[in-house]
């Protein structure tokens, strides 16, 4: 019973996802004290970000609606030190952050992290201003890492009659135009909870009109063809679904993709069992279906994106969201999203406060980073279908795509299967005809060290994954399997399998 037969549907792609399907975010709270944006100047962080290109970098979060651009604001001493240290260099071949500045900021970061998390839990948000230097820092990080910046604008700046006040956005657009910064835009974050956060209720129709106003601003600027995404609502519970519907009716015409957010759990109460529970993983399915129902009933054909998503809200679950255990949720969400037709999934966060980051405060990559990197290298944009034969086996979850054609090791027609084993025994996967005797490369991820699933280090096919140096990612070495052998997937592990020479015409 530990041998499992798979079924594939490869006649034609179910969906086509974006080359930037797996994308990342920087939470806007990083700009609460703009000095900490200097971390984005780290060459190591940029190397890690470059590994995930092509991808979007969304700058957004609750703080989006409490940030105000002040073009006259002076840079901090630390920011000036950073920019001065870069003066004689190619902006993208950045030298390190000045050591004294980095040391000072690192020592202050744990306190700042607590400030940000406390603000979040107490739902008491204060306005902060950010300067031209902050915008430069963000844009340079994205641009030098090969990421496309999506900038979230403050939607809580309102006139007396609750229309959106676009004057601050205009200042930012003018500055970005002057610097020839090419980026996309959002307006507001989780507007469904504005009442809770700011004692202001904005209905979906009003928000739709606000988006039209922003679109008009963009058309008048050098951003004539800039993309606009929204409304970044939370999970589609009744009132939020209604808000999304009325928003799309009023303003759906001007957005390029519909964005919504999803978290499985509350970070304060989540348990290891939750992270490994197929019932928890499956709740995502109904949320996706609900969003698609709303879109189909108002703006059919409009692309749907997960504009912010992770395992647990509130910064993640301590000792869980940054461990190997988080990978089950992350990989399953990627698989389900692709299978159900979501075009882009933005992971909260690439780097920043909390526990759900891909890269920690020392700029060291965590298990979900390595999982994301493998996904980028191996998984293509054409989505196919794999399923487990026989009775429903929700503890064994399988997904199938054409292999990434940008990977020089593989060729058009190859297949990438990725699988998650939530059983406590090894499962052996058997490929269907005509693939069972093909050469297969295995990329098995398992935790390293005594902490097991709660480890923050990971092995690929038995080799520990770590950076070669600050500028170099390690090679991701495959393990070729004997043709015709079943694909072993140990208990509580996940793996990619590339089926070579599959010659699938749909790919």
């Amino acid at each position: 019973q530990d041998v499992v037969d798979l079924d594939f549907f490869t006649q034609q792609p179910l969906h086509l996802v974006s080359p930037s399907f797996l994308s990342v975010t920087i939470d806007a709270n990083l700009a609460t004290d703009p000095r900490f944006l200097i971390f984005l100047g780290s060459p190591k962080l940029r190397t890690l970000a470059r590994g995930l290109s092509p991808a979007y970098l969304r700058f957004g979060g609750t703080k989006t609606d409490f940030l105000i651009f002040d073009p006259k604001k002076e840079s901090t001493f630390e920011e000036r030190s950073y920019w001065q240290s870069q003066v004689n260099q190619d902006i993208c071949k950045s030298g390190s952050i000045p050591p004294d500045v980095e040391e000072k900021l690192r020592s202050e970061w744990p306190y700042q992290e607590q400030v940000l998390l406390r603000e979040h839990y107490q739902k008491k948000f204060k306005n902060s201003t950010y300067s031209r230097s902050s915008v430069d820092m963000l844009y340079t990080f994205a641009n030098c890492s090969g990421l496309d910046l999506i900038f979230g604008l403050n939607a809580l700046l309102r006139t007396a009659d609750l229309q959106w006040n676009s004057s601050n956005a205009q200042l930012l657009l003018d500055y970005c135009s002057s610097k020839r910064y090419n980026m996309s835009w959002e307006l507001g974050n989780e507007p469904n909870s504005f009442l809770k956060k700011a004692d202001i209720f904005i209905n979906g129709s009003q928000l739709g009109e606000d988006f039209i106003q922003l679109h008009k601003l963009l058309r008048k600027s050098t951003f004539k063809n800039a993309k606009l995404y929204g409304p970044d609502v939370g999970q589609p519970r009744r009132k939020t679904a209604e808000m999304l519907k009325s928003f799309l009716k009023a303003g759906g015409e001007v957005i390029d993709s519909v964005t919504w957010h999803h978290y499985y759990l509350n970070g304060r109460t989540a348990t290891e069992e939750d992270f490994l529970n197929p019932d928890v993983l499956d709740i995502f399915i109904s949320s996706v279906q609900k969003v698609f129902q709303v879109v189909e009933s108002t703006r059919p054909g409009k692309k749907v994106w997960l504009g912010e998503t992770s395992s647990a809200y509130g910064g993640g679950a301590p000792l869980l969201s940054d461990t190997f255990a988080a990978g089950f949720m992350w990989l399953d969400k990627l698989g389900l999203s692709a299978r159900m037709g979501i075009e882009v999934v933005m992971r909260q966060v690439f780097f920043g406060a909390g526990n759900y980051h891909l890269v920690d405060e020392n700029f060291d990559p965590l298990p979900d980073y390595w999982l994301s990197l493998l996904f980028k290298k191996l998984v293509g944009t054409k989505v196919l279908m794999a399923s487990v034969k026989g009775p429903k086996r929700r503890n064994l979850r399988v997904y199938l795509h054409c292999t990434n054609t940008d990977n020089p090791m593989y060729k058009e027609g190859d297949l990438t299967l990725y699988a998650i084993n939530l059983y406590n025994v090894t499962k052996y996967l058997r490929l269907p005809y005509p693939f069972f005797d093909k050469q297969v490369d295995k990329y098995l991820l398992r935790p390293l060290g005594p902490h097991g699933l709660l480890s923050k280090a990971v092995q690929l096919n038995g080799q520990t994954l770590k950076m070669v140096d600050d500028q170099t990612l390690p090679p991701l070495m495959e393990k070729p399997l004997r043709p015709g052998s079943s694909l072993g997937l140990p208990a509580f592990s996940y793996s990619f399998f590339v089926i070579r020479n599959a010659k699938v015409a749909a790919c």
Epitope: E209, I212, Q213, K216, S246, K249, E253, D256, T298, P300
Partner: antibody, heavy 122, light 106 residues
Framework: QVQLQESGPGLVKPSQTLSLTCTVS??????????WSWIRQHPGKGLEWIGF???????FYNPSLKSRITISVDTSKNQFSLKLSSVTAADTAVYYC??????????????WGQGTMVTVSS | SYELTQPPSVSVSPGRTASITCSED??????AYWYQQKPGQSPVLVIY???ERPSGIPERFSGSNSGNTATLTISGTQAMDEADYYC?????????FGGGTKLTVL
């Protein structure tokens, strides 16, 4: 270059159902994500939007006509159709099929059929 | 319900500027579109998204939209511009047309 051509009977009796078809040539009805529309114009009067359909079958109708309209699509024939039930003399008009100028912008039409005159009379 | 109001007729001398208005509460919060229709012909889109001109439409056609009013302006009006003009907007999943304005070139 996409072209649209309306077809159907020019005369319909009161209380019957008006049926028109729009044939799309020069492009596929199911590519590009366009909303395919019906618009009418009463003699000597202005334009009135009837409704539109997406290739997946999702429809949107003018609220004032909603109870009498059915718009359907046949991707295999590259056609979409209008049915208007319980017609009266007030439904006498030139009926146009139209397509928006862009797949993102549903409400502005840059490709129109030449129109077909439908008279409701016994 | 949403109604776009246009003057029934506007007259202009050749070479002068003609302005046709389209009104509705907070129309400036939406995008306005304009069509030209000559007798016996199908409508032609002349302005989209308030002020954009489709390819092939002469530069003398321009548009604006703010407050409660969208305006179609034809500068240096020519005899060939004599036609009916319709404004149009999108309101909550429905398309709404104005009643039309007959432009007469004197």
């Amino acid at each position: 270059q996409v072209q649209l051509q309306e077809s159907g009977p020019g005369l319909v009796k009161p209380s019957q159902t008006l049926s028109l078809t729009c044939t799309v040539s020069g492009g596929s009805i199911s590519s590009g994500g366009y909303y395919w529309s019906w618009i009418r114009q009463h003699p000597g009067k202005g334009l009135e939007w009837i409704g539109f359909i997406y290739y997946s079958g999702s429809t949107f109708y003018n609220p004032s006509l909603k109870s009498r309209i059915t718009i359907s699509v046949d991707t295999s024939k590259n056609q979409f159709s209008l049915k208007l039930s319980s017609v009266t003399a007030a439904d006498t008009a030139v009926y146009y099929c139209a397509r928006p100028y862009s797949s993102s912008w549903y409400g502005a039409f840059d490709i129109w059929g030449q129109g077909t005159m439908v008279t409701v009379s016994s | 319900s949403y109604e776009l109001t246009q003057p029934p007729s506007v007259s202009v001398s050749p070479g002068r500027t003609a302005s046709i208005t389209c009104s509705e509460d907070k129309l400036g919060n939406k995008y306005a579109y304009w069509y030209q229709q000559k007798p016996g012909q199908s409508p032609v889109l002349v302005i989209y998204q308030d002020s954009e001109r489709p390819s092939g439409i002469p530069e003398r056609f321009s548009g604006s939209n703010s407050g409660n009013t969208a305006t179609l302006t034809i500068s240096g009006t020519q005899a060939m511009d004599e036609a009916d003009y319709y404004c149009q907007a999108w309101d909550s999943s429905t398309v709404v047309f104005g009643g039309g304005t007959k432009l007469t070139v004197l």
